[in-house]
Interface confidence: low
Amino acid sequence: GSLHSPGLSECFQVNGADYRGHQNRTGPRGAGRPCLFWDQTQQHSYSSASDPHGRWGLGAHNFCRNPDGDVQPWCYVAETEEGIYWRYCDIPSCHMPGYLGCFVDSGAPPALSGPSGTSTKLTVQVCLRFCRMKGYQLAGVEAGYACFCGSESDLARGRLAPATDCDQICFGHPGQLCGGDGRLGVYEVSVGSCQGNWTAPQGVIYSPDFPDEYGPDRNCSWALGPPGAALELTFRLFELADPRDRLELRDAASGSLLRAFDGARPPPSGPLRLGTAALLLTFRSDARGHAQGFALTYRGLQDAAEDPEAPEGSAQTPAAPLDGANVSCSPRPGAPPAA
């Protein structure tokens, strides 16, 4: 779940609403109850018939999904609505990058040793913001209302609990989980931060305040400079309220605007290959701004020709994005797989 291993995650929303994987039992690796097929659940509230455009990912399959904004993906396990007819799915790959897991907190000593606090309006981001402000790397939410701060060294001695133990709804947000009884849901504080300098070979950048909705009048910048001569960005989530909420991508060296996306003009679905080694991302929201925001993964490319469409060109220093640009490259049968 680290921000530096985004390729391992199938989910980028805190409640797994974007899960489109193929787990079809309530437990991982064949454990748990088998799920019913969504096209055979018309007697229930949710079925493929209630999702004709596939917006929620329902269809002629029995994969776990979250069509109703619940706290995590789930599925129906029984035909009738007597007793337990649905269950949450425990999907190890469905945790947003930056979520480090569910940890045991016995309280003596606490799993995260830094400052703590409680709030009847606790959300994941409220805790992240608190710990960020205190200068800590990690934030942990517990029992729906408690927030703890700590550092990587705390986790080294921490004990992982089953993911399903962190099942308590945050007091401040019905669509988020905030740990459990004696269980701490731990996040990296860089999630939803308003600034950052990203130099790891790959990673994830979230909109400010994520996983909460971004707030009004936000003006945030992130510098990307992973090793390599070029960059690849992939938007995993993009929901801006209107055209006045805008994300700009600029070449860090020249300040040249490479592209701007906004609520009316979202990014395309595929990876953006940018022939610049250093990128500046700027996000601005207007006075009304409130929406889920964005999550994007990036990875450094060794050269700007790591592009399946790019024919080999004559040697020239890459500094701006373009498929098929003349850049120095070595022969290769095809581009490497995405991270």
Partner: antibody, heavy 119, light 107 residues
Framework: QVQLVQSGAEVKKPGASVKVSCKAS????????MNWVRQAPGQGLEWMGD????????NYNQKFKGRVTMTTDKSTSTAYMELRSLRSDDTAVYYC????????????WGQGTLVTVSS | DIQMTQSPSSVSASVGDRVTITCKAS??????VAWYQQKPGKAPKLLIY???YRYTGVPSRFSGSGSGTDFTLTISSLQPEDFATYYC?????????FGGGTKVEIK
């Protein structure tokens, strides 16, 4: 290889509408914006707007707002540009043009569709 | 909208000549300028992007320079196939706008 193939020439009367198609191949259609650019006889190039095929969201040049509609059909990898209330000064060659991977120029163009508006 | 003013509107030159075309933006567009070549009855072809980067397959005799508001396309040694109309375009913000074009004719 990337190809954009447009529909044939059209002759229309003033006040009518025209719908030009642009069939894309050789790349993942939903991964790139499709732009529409027109060129009146002997004149320069004028950007009309673009469409994001993945979301179906479009962005129009203010000059054409209210008269132009851009759509896509993902199943056939085809983009469409409809221009309504045609006037004689809409006589032009209409091009579809695909964005580059980095969005810094129009890397691929259709062959163009001549639309003649005449009474 | 950002205006792109190209000059000259036409130029007569001979094979082997050095040809320079300029483009002035009505406001700062950083290096967000592309250059296209268009021959009669054909679609434009991308030559230069981000002011100075040659697109794939474009001969090295074509070069671009400039930033801010002033940009230049240079053909170092004009070849017979280079007689065409050339357009600059800013992609700094929406809507992208083109210059009026420069026709390079045989002297």
């Amino acid at each position: 290889q990337v190809q954009l193939v447009q529909s044939g020439a059209e002759v229309k009367k003033p006040g009518a509408s025209v719908k030009v198609s642009c069939k894309a191949s050789g790349y993942t259609f939903t991964d790139y914006y499709m732009n529409w650019v027109r060129q009146a006889p002997g004149q320069g190039l004028e950007w009309m707007g673009d469409i994001n095929p993945y979301y179906g969201s479009s962005n129009y040049n203010q000059k054409f707002k209210g008269r132009v509609t851009m759509t896509t059909d993902k199943s056939t990898s085809t983009a469409y540009m409809e221009l309504r209330s045609l006037r004689s000064d809409d006589t032009a060659v209409y091009y579809c043009a695909r964005d580059s991977s980095g969005y810094v120029g129009f890397a691929y163009w259709g062959q163009g569709t001549l639309v003649t508006v005449s009474s | 909208d950002i205006q792109m003013t190209q000059s000259p509107s036409s130029v007569s030159a001979s094979v082997g000549d050095r040809v320079t075309i300029t483009c002035k933006a009505s406001q700062d567009v950083s290096t967000s300028v592309a250059w296209y070549q268009q021959k009669p009855g054909k679609a434009p072809k991308l030559l230069i992007y981000s002011a100075s980067y040659r697109y794939t397959g474009v001969p090295s005799r074509f070069s671009g320079s400039g930033s801010g508001t002033d940009f230049t396309l240079t053909i170092s040694s004009l070849q017979p196939e280079d007689f065409a109309t050339y357009y600059c375009q800013q992609h700094y913000n929406t809507p992208p706008t083109f210059g009026g074009g420069t026709k390079v004719e045989i002297k």
